[in-house]
Protein backbone atom coordinates (compact mmCIF):
# COMPACT_ATOMS: atom_id res chain seq x y z
CA UNK A 1 0.00 0.00 0.00
CA UNK A 2 0.98 3.64 -0.31
CA UNK A 3 0.11 6.91 1.36
CA UNK A 4 -1.18 9.77 -0.77
CA UNK A 5 -1.15 13.39 0.29
CA UNK A 6 -3.98 15.09 -1.62
CA UNK A 7 -2.40 18.48 -0.93
CA UNK A 8 1.30 19.24 -0.68
CA UNK A 9 0.92 22.83 0.53
CA UNK A 10 -1.56 24.52 2.84
CA UNK A 11 -1.44 28.32 3.13
CA UNK A 12 -3.57 29.61 5.98
CA UNK A 13 -4.20 32.86 7.83
CA UNK A 14 -3.31 33.17 11.49
CA UNK A 15 -6.21 32.23 13.77
CA UNK A 16 -7.84 29.94 11.22
CA UNK A 17 -8.06 26.15 11.54
CA UNK A 18 -6.75 23.61 9.04
CA UNK A 19 -7.18 19.90 8.46
CA UNK A 20 -4.15 18.14 7.01
CA UNK A 21 -5.06 14.93 5.22
CA UNK A 22 -3.45 11.66 4.15
CA UNK A 23 -5.03 8.70 2.41
CA UNK A 24 -4.11 5.03 2.27
CA UNK A 25 -3.96 3.78 -1.30
CA UNK A 26 -3.62 0.40 -2.90
CA UNK A 27 -4.38 -3.06 -1.57
CA UNK A 28 -4.83 -2.94 2.18
CA UNK A 29 -4.76 -6.31 3.92
CA UNK A 30 -7.77 -6.42 6.22
CA UNK A 31 -6.97 -9.74 7.82
CA UNK A 32 -7.48 -10.21 11.54
CA UNK A 33 -3.73 -10.39 12.05
CA UNK A 34 -3.06 -7.02 10.44
CA UNK A 35 -3.38 -3.72 12.27
CA UNK A 36 -2.46 -0.16 11.46
CA UNK A 37 -0.72 2.44 13.57
CA UNK A 38 -1.21 5.93 12.17
CA UNK A 39 0.27 9.11 13.52
CA UNK A 40 1.38 12.65 12.80
CA UNK A 41 4.48 14.67 13.60
CA UNK A 42 6.50 17.63 12.43
CA UNK A 43 9.70 17.07 10.54
CA UNK A 44 12.26 18.54 8.21
CA UNK A 45 13.55 17.55 4.82
CA UNK A 46 16.22 15.53 6.57
CA UNK A 47 19.57 14.19 5.54
CA UNK A 48 18.37 10.57 5.63
CA UNK A 49 14.99 11.11 4.00
CA UNK A 50 12.03 13.42 4.34
CA UNK A 51 10.04 12.64 7.49
CA UNK A 52 12.82 10.61 9.13
CA UNK A 53 13.14 13.27 11.83
CA UNK A 54 10.25 13.36 14.30
CA UNK A 55 9.38 16.53 16.17
CA UNK A 56 6.34 17.23 18.33
CA UNK A 57 3.27 19.09 17.10
CA UNK A 58 2.46 21.72 19.73
CA UNK A 59 4.40 19.71 22.30
CA UNK A 60 2.54 16.48 21.52
CA UNK A 61 4.72 13.63 20.29
CA UNK A 62 3.85 11.13 17.59
CA UNK A 63 2.91 8.75 20.42
CA UNK A 64 0.38 11.22 21.82
CA UNK A 65 -1.23 11.70 18.41
CA UNK A 66 -1.39 8.12 17.22
CA UNK A 67 -4.45 6.36 15.90
CA UNK A 68 -4.60 2.67 16.28
CA UNK A 69 -6.99 0.15 14.83
CA UNK A 70 -7.58 -2.85 12.61
CA UNK A 71 -8.38 -2.66 8.93
CA UNK A 72 -12.16 -2.16 9.30
CA UNK A 73 -12.34 0.32 12.15
CA UNK A 74 -12.36 4.07 12.41
CA UNK A 75 -10.53 5.73 15.26
CA UNK A 76 -9.84 8.98 17.07
CA UNK A 77 -7.01 9.99 19.35
CA UNK A 78 -7.62 10.51 23.04
CA UNK A 79 -9.54 13.75 22.95
CA UNK A 80 -8.54 15.31 26.21
CA UNK A 81 -4.80 15.64 25.67
CA UNK A 82 -4.98 16.60 22.01
CA UNK A 83 -7.89 18.99 22.34
CA UNK A 84 -6.17 20.90 25.10
CA UNK A 85 -3.55 21.70 22.47
CA UNK A 86 -6.09 22.57 19.79
CA UNK A 87 -5.47 19.31 17.92
CA UNK A 88 -7.52 16.34 16.82
CA UNK A 89 -6.50 13.43 14.65
CA UNK A 90 -9.07 11.12 13.13
CA UNK A 91 -9.44 8.24 10.71
CA UNK A 92 -12.39 6.94 8.67
CA UNK A 93 -13.33 3.62 7.13
CA UNK A 94 -12.05 4.57 3.70
CA UNK A 95 -8.35 4.94 4.41
CA UNK A 96 -8.41 8.67 4.95
CA UNK A 97 -6.92 10.13 8.12
CA UNK A 98 -6.27 13.66 9.20
CA UNK A 99 -5.12 16.05 11.84
CA UNK A 100 -7.03 19.24 12.57
CA UNK A 101 -5.19 22.20 14.07
CA UNK A 102 -7.22 25.04 15.50
CA UNK A 103 -6.25 28.66 16.10
CA UNK A 104 -3.15 28.60 13.90
CA UNK A 105 -0.15 30.74 14.74
CA UNK A 106 3.02 31.53 12.82
CA UNK A 107 4.80 28.93 14.96
CA UNK A 108 2.71 26.21 13.33
CA UNK A 109 4.39 26.75 9.96
CA UNK A 110 6.56 23.90 8.77
CA UNK A 111 6.68 20.39 7.35
CA UNK A 112 4.13 17.87 8.62
CA UNK A 113 4.28 14.12 8.16
CA UNK A 114 1.70 11.39 8.42
CA UNK A 115 3.04 7.93 9.17
CA UNK A 116 1.29 4.62 8.67
CA UNK A 117 2.75 1.43 10.08
CA UNK A 118 1.22 -1.78 8.83
CA UNK A 119 1.75 -4.37 11.53
CA UNK A 120 1.68 -7.83 10.03
CA UNK A 121 2.48 -10.20 12.83
CA UNK A 122 5.29 -12.64 12.07
CA UNK A 123 6.54 -10.13 9.51
CA UNK A 124 8.45 -6.92 9.92
CA UNK A 125 6.63 -3.61 10.11
CA UNK A 126 5.89 -1.84 6.86
CA UNK A 127 6.15 1.94 7.16
CA UNK A 128 4.97 4.55 4.70
CA UNK A 129 4.68 8.28 5.17
CA UNK A 130 3.46 11.41 3.45
CA UNK A 131 4.71 14.97 3.76
CA UNK A 132 3.03 18.35 3.38
CA UNK A 133 3.94 21.95 4.07
CA UNK A 134 1.90 24.34 6.18
CA UNK A 135 2.47 28.07 5.82
CA UNK A 136 0.68 30.30 8.28
CA UNK A 137 0.56 33.92 7.19
CA UNK A 138 -0.36 37.14 8.87
CA UNK A 139 -0.98 40.68 7.68
CA UNK A 140 -2.55 42.09 4.55
CA UNK A 141 -1.02 39.46 2.25
CA UNK A 142 -2.55 36.58 4.16
CA UNK A 143 -5.49 34.77 2.55
CA UNK A 144 -8.86 35.09 4.22
CA UNK A 145 -9.23 31.29 4.28
CA UNK A 146 -6.84 28.39 3.88
CA UNK A 147 -5.67 27.82 0.32
CA UNK A 148 -4.55 24.30 -0.56
CA UNK A 149 -2.34 23.23 -3.43
CA UNK A 150 -2.87 19.72 -4.82
CA UNK A 151 0.13 17.45 -4.93
CA UNK A 152 -0.32 16.53 -8.59
CA UNK A 153 -0.60 20.03 -10.02
CA UNK A 154 -0.23 23.52 -8.71
CA UNK A 155 -3.86 24.55 -9.12
CA UNK A 156 -5.01 25.96 -5.83
CA UNK A 157 -8.29 25.41 -4.04
CA UNK A 158 -9.94 27.59 -1.43
CA UNK A 159 -11.28 25.80 1.61
CA UNK A 160 -13.56 27.42 4.14
Amino acid sequence: FKVATPYSLYVCPEGQQVTLTCRLLGPVDKGHDVTFYKTWYRSSRGEVQTCSERRPIRNLTFQDLHLHHGGHQAANTSHDLAQRHGLESASDHHGQFSITMRNLTLLDSGLYCCLVVEIRHHHSEHRVHGAMELQVQTGKDAPSNCVVYPSSSQDSENIT
Partner: antibody
Amino acid sequence: QVQLQESGPGLVKPSETLSLTCTVSGGSISSYYWSWIRQPPGKGLEWIGYIYYSGSTNYNPSLKSRVTISVDTSKSQFSLKLSSVTAADTAVYYCARDIPASAFDIWGQGTMVIVSS
Amino acid sequence: EIVLTQSPATLSLSPGERATLSCRASQSVSYYLAWYQQKPGQAPRLLIYDAFNRATGIPARFSGSGSGTDFTLTISSLEPEDFAVYYCQQRINWPLTFGGGTKVEIK
Protein backbone atom coordinates in the same frame (compact mmCIF):
# COMPACT_ATOMS: atom_id res chain seq x y z
CA GLN B 1 3.16 7.91 33.71
CA VAL B 2 3.15 4.32 32.46
CA GLN B 3 5.01 1.85 34.67
CA LEU B 4 5.76 -1.85 34.25
CA GLN B 5 6.31 -4.36 37.03
CA GLU B 6 7.48 -7.95 36.59
CA SER B 7 6.49 -10.63 39.07
CA GLY B 8 7.04 -14.36 39.41
CA PRO B 9 9.26 -16.94 41.05
CA GLY B 10 12.97 -16.23 41.20
CA LEU B 11 13.96 -19.89 41.20
CA VAL B 12 12.85 -22.53 38.70
CA LYS B 13 13.98 -26.13 38.46
CA PRO B 14 15.50 -27.50 35.23
CA SER B 15 12.93 -28.94 32.78
CA GLU B 16 10.12 -26.98 34.46
CA THR B 17 8.25 -23.95 33.10
CA LEU B 18 9.25 -20.40 33.93
CA SER B 19 6.20 -18.15 34.41
CA LEU B 20 6.33 -14.37 34.74
CA THR B 21 3.71 -11.64 34.69
CA CYS B 22 4.08 -7.97 33.80
CA THR B 23 1.55 -5.49 35.17
CA VAL B 24 1.01 -2.26 33.25
CA SER B 25 -0.08 0.70 35.38
CA GLY B 26 -0.72 4.35 34.65
CA GLY B 27 -1.79 3.87 31.05
CA SER B 28 -3.56 1.77 28.48
CA ILE B 29 -2.34 -1.61 27.31
CA SER B 30 -3.82 -0.85 23.89
CA SER B 31 -1.87 0.39 20.88
CA TYR B 32 1.52 -1.08 21.63
CA TYR B 33 3.63 -4.19 21.46
CA TRP B 34 4.38 -5.66 24.88
CA SER B 35 7.68 -7.49 24.86
CA TRP B 36 9.80 -9.73 26.99
CA ILE B 37 13.58 -9.31 26.86
CA ARG B 38 16.18 -11.17 28.87
CA GLN B 39 19.77 -10.63 29.89
CA PRO B 40 21.96 -13.46 31.19
CA PRO B 41 24.38 -12.40 33.96
CA GLY B 42 27.18 -10.27 32.52
CA LYS B 43 25.86 -10.60 28.97
CA GLY B 44 23.83 -8.68 26.41
CA LEU B 45 20.12 -8.35 25.69
CA GLU B 46 17.97 -10.91 23.89
CA TRP B 47 14.45 -10.21 22.63
CA ILE B 48 12.13 -13.11 23.49
CA GLY B 49 8.95 -11.97 21.79
CA TYR B 50 5.97 -9.66 21.92
CA ILE B 51 2.23 -9.74 22.24
CA TYR B 52 0.06 -7.11 20.67
CA TYR B 53 -2.87 -5.88 22.73
CA SER B 54 -5.09 -7.63 20.16
CA GLY B 55 -3.52 -10.96 21.15
CA SER B 56 -1.27 -11.45 18.12
CA THR B 57 2.19 -12.71 19.01
CA ASN B 58 5.65 -12.85 17.50
CA TYR B 59 8.50 -14.86 19.00
CA ASN B 60 12.22 -15.08 18.55
CA PRO B 61 12.79 -18.20 16.40
CA SER B 62 15.57 -19.31 18.75
CA LEU B 63 13.01 -19.72 21.55
CA LYS B 64 9.75 -20.12 19.64
CA SER B 65 9.19 -23.78 20.43
CA ARG B 66 9.31 -23.09 24.17
CA VAL B 67 7.68 -19.65 24.48
CA THR B 68 4.10 -18.55 25.06
CA ILE B 69 3.15 -14.91 25.67
CA SER B 70 -0.43 -14.05 26.59
CA VAL B 71 -2.34 -10.92 27.54
CA ASP B 72 -5.19 -10.15 29.94
CA THR B 73 -6.40 -6.69 28.97
CA SER B 74 -8.95 -6.60 31.79
CA LYS B 75 -6.11 -6.81 34.31
CA SER B 76 -3.63 -4.79 32.23
CA GLN B 77 -1.22 -7.69 32.38
CA PHE B 78 0.77 -9.80 29.99
CA SER B 79 2.60 -12.99 30.79
CA LEU B 80 5.55 -15.11 29.71
CA LYS B 81 5.82 -18.88 29.88
CA LEU B 82 9.09 -20.56 28.94
CA SER B 83 9.03 -24.33 29.06
CA SER B 84 11.75 -26.95 29.50
CA VAL B 85 14.18 -24.50 31.07
CA THR B 86 17.88 -25.17 31.56
CA ALA B 87 20.66 -23.29 33.32
CA ALA B 88 21.15 -21.32 30.07
CA ASP B 89 17.79 -19.64 30.75
CA THR B 90 19.12 -18.04 33.94
CA ALA B 91 18.81 -14.31 33.34
CA VAL B 92 17.22 -11.04 34.33
CA TYR B 93 13.86 -10.94 32.56
CA TYR B 94 12.49 -7.55 31.54
CA CYS B 95 9.08 -6.61 30.24
CA ALA B 96 8.98 -3.56 28.00
CA ARG B 97 6.63 -1.43 25.95
CA ASP B 98 7.57 -1.26 22.30
CA ILE B 99 6.11 1.52 20.17
CA PRO B 100 5.45 0.71 16.50
CA ALA B 101 8.09 2.27 14.24
CA SER B 102 10.05 3.38 17.29
CA ALA B 103 11.69 1.42 20.13
CA PHE B 104 11.39 0.02 23.66
CA ASP B 105 10.56 3.23 25.50
CA ILE B 106 9.44 1.91 28.89
CA TRP B 107 10.97 -1.02 30.77
CA GLY B 108 10.20 -2.85 33.96
CA GLN B 109 12.94 -2.96 36.56
CA GLY B 110 13.65 -6.60 35.72
CA THR B 111 13.39 -9.79 37.72
CA MET B 112 16.20 -12.29 38.17
CA VAL B 113 15.26 -15.89 37.44
CA ILE B 114 17.71 -18.64 38.36
CA VAL B 115 17.32 -22.11 36.91
CA SER B 116 18.78 -24.58 39.35
CA SER B 117 17.86 -27.80 41.09
CA GLU C 1 18.70 -12.69 11.69
CA ILE C 2 20.54 -9.38 11.60
CA VAL C 3 23.75 -9.29 13.62
CA LEU C 4 24.81 -5.99 15.19
CA THR C 5 28.48 -5.57 16.06
CA GLN C 6 29.44 -2.80 18.47
CA SER C 7 32.88 -1.33 18.83
CA PRO C 8 34.91 -0.78 20.81
CA ALA C 9 33.91 -3.26 23.51
CA THR C 10 35.24 -0.83 26.12
CA LEU C 11 35.90 2.88 25.89
CA SER C 12 37.99 4.51 28.64
CA LEU C 13 37.45 8.26 28.82
CA SER C 14 37.41 11.12 31.30
CA PRO C 15 34.47 13.36 32.15
CA GLY C 16 34.19 16.19 29.64
CA GLU C 17 35.62 14.12 26.80
CA ARG C 18 33.74 13.17 23.64
CA ALA C 19 32.62 9.55 23.26
CA THR C 20 32.06 7.95 19.87
CA LEU C 21 30.42 4.52 19.81
CA SER C 22 29.96 2.44 16.69
CA CYS C 23 27.33 -0.10 15.66
CA ARG C 24 27.62 -2.07 12.43
CA ALA C 25 24.80 -4.21 10.99
CA SER C 26 25.31 -7.40 8.99
CA GLN C 27 22.84 -6.03 6.41
CA SER C 28 21.09 -2.73 5.85
CA VAL C 29 18.64 -1.67 8.53
CA SER C 30 17.83 1.61 6.76
CA TYR C 31 17.68 4.07 9.66
CA TYR C 32 15.63 1.78 11.92
CA LEU C 33 18.14 1.64 14.75
CA ALA C 34 17.87 2.53 18.44
CA TRP C 35 20.40 3.15 21.19
CA TYR C 36 20.00 2.35 24.90
CA GLN C 37 21.97 3.12 28.03
CA GLN C 38 22.20 0.62 30.87
CA LYS C 39 23.70 1.20 34.29
CA PRO C 40 24.54 -1.65 36.70
CA GLY C 41 21.46 -3.13 38.33
CA GLN C 42 19.10 -1.05 36.18
CA ALA C 43 16.94 -1.63 33.13
CA PRO C 44 18.07 -0.17 29.82
CA ARG C 45 16.92 3.37 29.00
CA LEU C 46 16.00 4.47 25.49
CA LEU C 47 18.24 7.26 24.19
CA ILE C 48 17.76 7.36 20.42
CA TYR C 49 15.30 5.80 17.98
CA ASP C 50 15.36 5.79 14.18
CA ALA C 51 19.12 6.44 14.19
CA PHE C 52 19.01 10.05 15.33
CA ASN C 53 15.72 10.96 17.03
CA ARG C 54 16.29 11.65 20.72
CA ALA C 55 13.75 10.06 23.04
CA THR C 56 11.75 12.27 25.38
CA GLY C 57 13.86 13.77 28.14
CA ILE C 58 17.24 12.76 26.71
CA PRO C 59 19.89 15.52 26.93
CA ALA C 60 21.16 17.14 23.75
CA ARG C 61 24.70 15.88 24.39
CA PHE C 62 23.50 12.50 23.06
CA SER C 63 23.25 12.33 19.30
CA GLY C 64 22.93 9.54 16.78
CA SER C 65 23.85 9.33 13.12
CA GLY C 66 24.15 6.88 10.27
CA SER C 67 22.01 4.79 7.97
CA GLY C 68 22.28 1.49 6.15
CA THR C 69 24.86 -0.58 8.01
CA ASP C 70 27.00 1.93 9.93
CA PHE C 71 25.76 3.92 12.90
CA THR C 72 27.32 6.14 15.54
CA LEU C 73 26.24 7.30 18.98
CA THR C 74 28.08 10.41 20.10
CA ILE C 75 28.18 11.85 23.61
CA SER C 76 29.57 15.34 23.07
CA SER C 77 30.88 15.88 26.58
CA LEU C 78 30.74 13.03 29.08
CA GLU C 79 29.00 13.68 32.39
CA PRO C 80 29.71 11.46 35.41
CA GLU C 81 26.29 9.81 35.00
CA ASP C 82 27.04 8.80 31.40
CA PHE C 83 29.47 6.03 32.34
CA ALA C 84 27.48 2.91 31.52
CA VAL C 85 26.97 0.22 28.89
CA TYR C 86 25.38 1.24 25.58
CA TYR C 87 23.46 -1.09 23.27
CA CYS C 88 22.19 -0.64 19.72
CA GLN C 89 19.09 -2.44 18.46
CA GLN C 90 17.57 -2.88 15.00
CA ARG C 91 13.89 -3.08 14.12
CA ILE C 92 13.82 -3.49 10.36
CA ASN C 93 13.43 -7.26 10.66
CA TRP C 94 12.13 -9.73 13.17
CA PRO C 95 13.59 -11.07 15.36
CA LEU C 96 14.60 -7.79 16.92
CA THR C 97 18.28 -7.97 17.78
CA PHE C 98 20.71 -6.06 19.97
CA GLY C 99 24.41 -5.40 19.68
CA GLY C 100 26.79 -6.84 22.24
CA GLY C 101 27.27 -3.49 23.96
CA THR C 102 29.99 -0.91 24.52
CA LYS C 103 31.09 -0.15 28.06
CA VAL C 104 32.05 3.47 28.63
CA GLU C 105 34.24 3.55 31.73
CA ILE C 106 36.07 6.26 33.62
CA LYS C 107 39.71 6.54 32.63
